[in-house]
């Protein structure tokens, strides 16, 4: 053996291999990556684990391993096996794990695997398998996991699977399967996980998943499906469903009616245009629903019975209104993204107490009422950019203590209510041409980034102080000071703010000191210092 020292390794450790005793005085033998072209011959009968992976073994002579009655795991991955004869694994009564991946098998061995009664895990992935003989798995009564991915199968080997009633997880991914026949998995009543991703599946039998009564995860991603997989309706225990990256154009009414346990559905990267309004009803475990660019949707989906939804994204559709009681259906919603729709009016969202992020940009909203966002105590981000908002109720944002990001850019605002926005760190108001007033920076002690319609409005946020320093370097003998600025532009402040001028100026100077770290754009810049901007604004 290869392990040195006085603690003699039991006889039967092949040369160059690494051997150690397991807790039961059985031998773990690692002969991986040694350039072996044949099996070592002097293996101990007491071997429980044998790793022969990453060698150059091209043949498994029948009965060479038959004495290894304690062998529980045999690794033959990454060799050059093209064929495994009948009898190759005879006598391996304890074998639980057999790894044959990354070889050159063109078919599953017809008889070699039969009656391995203890076998629980079988890896046949990454071979060139195009044929699975009907009885090749017979007698594998304990098999739980089967890997057949990354092969050359064109059909599901229906007959071969009939004997695998104990199977719990199987992958047929990365093959060339084009159709799934009715009852293809009809006897796999214990199967929990089924991976069929990265095939060429374009059609599914109406009953192709019938019999999969325990199935919880079904992966149909990256296929050629052009219709919704209605065959899922019998999968009453399904929790995770993926059919993203297909060619599905519509999701029918009551699409998931037979799958009340669904937690996750992945269906992005499909050219979905239409979704039945009842498609996502009665999914009490669903947490996330994301649908982008379904341009034929005109009505907000009915989500009765889908009350645990935490994230709802429905962008790029033609939804023009939300139900008044939308939050009665969605009390657990944390993220609501309805950007790029045709929403004009908003109901009160105050029932959605857990909302943290709302994105309503690129809609047709014209007014924010006082009740719309009332008492959303957890709301952190609100995006209302690119709408037609001309009116915002003075108290619209008054009960949003957690709000840190507010985007109202590219609207029609002429005034902006500041009540309740003292926690903001990000504020965007750019693109509101009618918004000419200065916004008192004292209302935003936490502000880090602000975007304003005009450069002069940045002066209230430390733009002047910063620019003053810069302009001092450019025009050192200018004699400009903050006092000069006050004198020059007193008229402006009187026009823009009705507070006592002196108070305002004191506040303004305090702000300049406190808020020097605020990034405000458009920046006045060195060639347009605040004093000039104020001046030119007065002329305007």
């Amino acid at each position: 053996g290869s392990s040195p020292g006085p603690d003699a390794i039991p006889r039967g450790c092949p040369s160059h291999c690494h051997c150690e005793l397991d807790g039961r005085m059985l031998l773990r033998v690692d002969c991986s990556d040694l350039g072996l072209s044949e099996l070592p011959s002097n293996l101990s009968v007491f071997t429980s684990y044998l790793d022969l992976s990453m060698n150059n073994i091209s043949q498994l002579p029948a009965s060479l391993l038959h004495r290894l009655c304690f062998l529980e795991e045999l690794r033959l991955a990454g060799n050059a096996l093209t064929h495994i004869p009948k009898g190759a694994f005879t006598g391996l009564h304890s074998l639980k794990v057999l790894m044959l991946q990354n070889n050159q098998l063109r078919q599953v061995p017809e008889e070699a695997l039969q009656n391995l009664r203890s076998l629980q895990s079988l890896r046949l992935d990454a071979n060139h398998i195009s044929y699975v003989p009907p009885s090749c798995f017979s007698g594998l009564h304990s098999l739980r996991h089967l890997w057949l991915d990354d092969n050359a199968l064109t059909d599901v080997p229906v007959q071969a699977f009939r004997s695998l009633s104990a199977l719990q997880a199987m992958t047929l991914a990365l093959n060339k399967i084009h159709h799934i026949a009715d009852y293809a998995f009809g006897n796999l009543s214990s199967l929990v996980v089924l991976h069929l991703h990265n095939n060429r599946i374009h059609s599914l039998g109406k009953k192709c998943f019938d019999g999969l009564h325990s199935l919880e995860t079904l992966d149909l991603n990256y296929n050629n499906l052009d219709e919704f997989p209605t065959a899922i309706k019998t999968l009453s225990n399904l929790k995770e469903l993926g059919f993203h990256s297909n060619n599905i154009r519509s999701i029918p009414e009551r699409a998931f009616v037979g799958n009340p346990s669904l937690i996750t559905i992945h269906f992005y990267d499909n050219p979905i245009q239409f979704v039945g309004v009842s498609a996502f009803q009665h999914l009490p475990e669903l947490r996330t629903l994301t649908l982008n660019g379904a341009s034929h949707i005109t009505e907000f989906p009915h989500l009765t019975g889908t009350a645990t939804l935490e994230s709802l994204t429905l962008t790029g559709a033609k939804i023009s209104s939300l139900p008044q009681a939308v939050c009665d259906q969605l009390p657990n919603l944390q993220v609501l993204d309805l950007s790029y729709n045709l929403l004009e009016d908003l109901p009160s969202l105050s029932g959605c107490q857990k909302l943290q992020k709302i994105d309503l940009r690129h809609n047709e909203i014209y007014e924010i009422k006082g009740s719309t966002f009332q008492q959303l105590f957890n709301l952190r981000s609100l995006n209302l950019a690119w709408n037609k908002i001309a009116i915002i109720h003075p108290n619209a944002f008054s009960t949003l203590p957690s709000l840190i990001k507010l985007d109202l850019s590219s609207n029609l605002l002429s005034s902006f209510p500041v009540t309740g926005l003292h926690g903001l760190t990000h504020l965007k108001l750019t693109g509101n041409r009618a918004l000419q007033s200065l916004i008192p920076s004292a209302n935003f002690p936490e502000l880090k980034i602000i975007e304003m319609p005009s450069a002069y409005q940045c002066c209230a946020f430390g733009g002047c102080e910063n620019v003053y320093k810069i302009s001092n370097q450019w025009n050192k003998d200018d004699g400009n000071s903050v006092d000069d600025l006050h004198k020059k532009d007193a008229g402006l402040f009187q026009v823009q703010d009705e507070r006592d001028l002196e108070d305002f100026l004191l506040d303004f100077e305090e702000d300049l000191k406190a808020l020097h770290s605020v990034q405000c754009s458009p920046s006045p810049g060195p060639f347009k210092p605040c004093e000039h901007l104020f001046g030119s604004w007065l002329i305007r």
Epitope: D155, K206, D210, R254
Partner: antibody
Framework: EVQLVQSGAEVKKPGASVKVSCKAS????????IEWVRQAPGQGLEWIGE????????DYNEKFKVRATFTSDTSTSTVYLELSSLRSEDTAVYYC???????????WGQGTLVTVSS | DIVMTQSPDSLAVSLGERATINCRAS??????????MHWYQQKPGQPPKLLIY???NLESGVPDRFSGSGSGTDFTLTISSLQAEDVAVYYC?????????FGQGTKVEIK
């Protein structure tokens, strides 16, 4: 224990309609198809069609497509067969059965005798 | 429609003897290696009872004297040793394609 319990016998006049119910228990109702089969007196078995309870999925024998309607009520785990425009040759025992292993009919209701007579 | 034809129409067999019923489909009912052919037993006044599914698989709880064989279009139900309680009408059925169809039935009696 899987059970399918059907409604009682009916006597109908020609041209009328009949609605037969089939209440399922002992298994996940929406996970198995329910088949409808009829048997005229002294005759063989004739498949009418099938429904997957709770869904909109149905299949009808072309012969019955116009006159038969299958519905289901998941709240009571009940499936219904309605047959309209009854004729005397519709006199038969109507069975519901569960589509089990590979579509074989593994559990059957006790049958409902529908007699059509003027 | 696929037509199922059973033979014989009736069969009288001595107790303990073998009974064989044939069923022929007008076209193959095989799909991906599965034969979508099932056998049922019906006793008077009772609904049918599933015996064999997919041509040869014994339904749970059915005595092993019943067996099925065949593929494609020709199928056989065999009772290896007829018992008194086996007196009934036996039907074959295909569910390979809609409409699912039954054979006309074979009546098994004791000789």
């Amino acid at each position: 224990e899987v059970q399918l319990v059907q409604s009682g016998a009916e006597v109908k006049k020609p041209g009328a309609s009949v609605k037969v119910s089939c209440k399922a228990s002992g298994y996940t109702f929406s996970a198995y198809w329910i088949e409808w089969v009829r048997q005229a007196p002294g005759q063989g078995l004739e498949w009418i069609g099938e429904i997957l309870p709770g869904s909109d999925s149905t299949d009808y024998n072309e012969k019955f497509k116009v006159r038969a309607t299958f519905t289901s009520d998941t709240s009571t785990s009940t499936v219904y067969l309605e047959l309209s425009s009854l004729r005397s040759e519709d006199t038969a025992v109507y069975y519901c059965a569960r589509g089990g292993h590979y579509g074989s009919l593994d559990y059957w209701g006790q049958g409902t005798l529908v007699t059509v007579s003027s | 429609d696929i037509v199922m034809t059973q033979s014989p129409d009736s069969l009288a067999v001595s107790l303990g003897e073998r009974a064989t019923i044939n069923c022929r489909a007008s076209e193959s009912v095989d799909n991906y290696g599965n034969s979508f052919m099932h056998w049922y037993q019906q006793k008077p006044g009772q609904p049918p009872k599933l015996l064999i599914y997919l041509a040869s698989n014994l339904e749970s709880g059915v005595p092993d004297r019943f067996s099925g064989s065949g593929s494609g279009t020709d199928f056989t139900l065999t009772i290896s040793s007829l018992q008194a309680e086996d007196v009934a009408v036996y039907y074959c059925q295909q569910n390979y394609e809609d409409p699912f169809t039954f054979g006309q039935g074979t009546k098994v009696e004791i000789k």
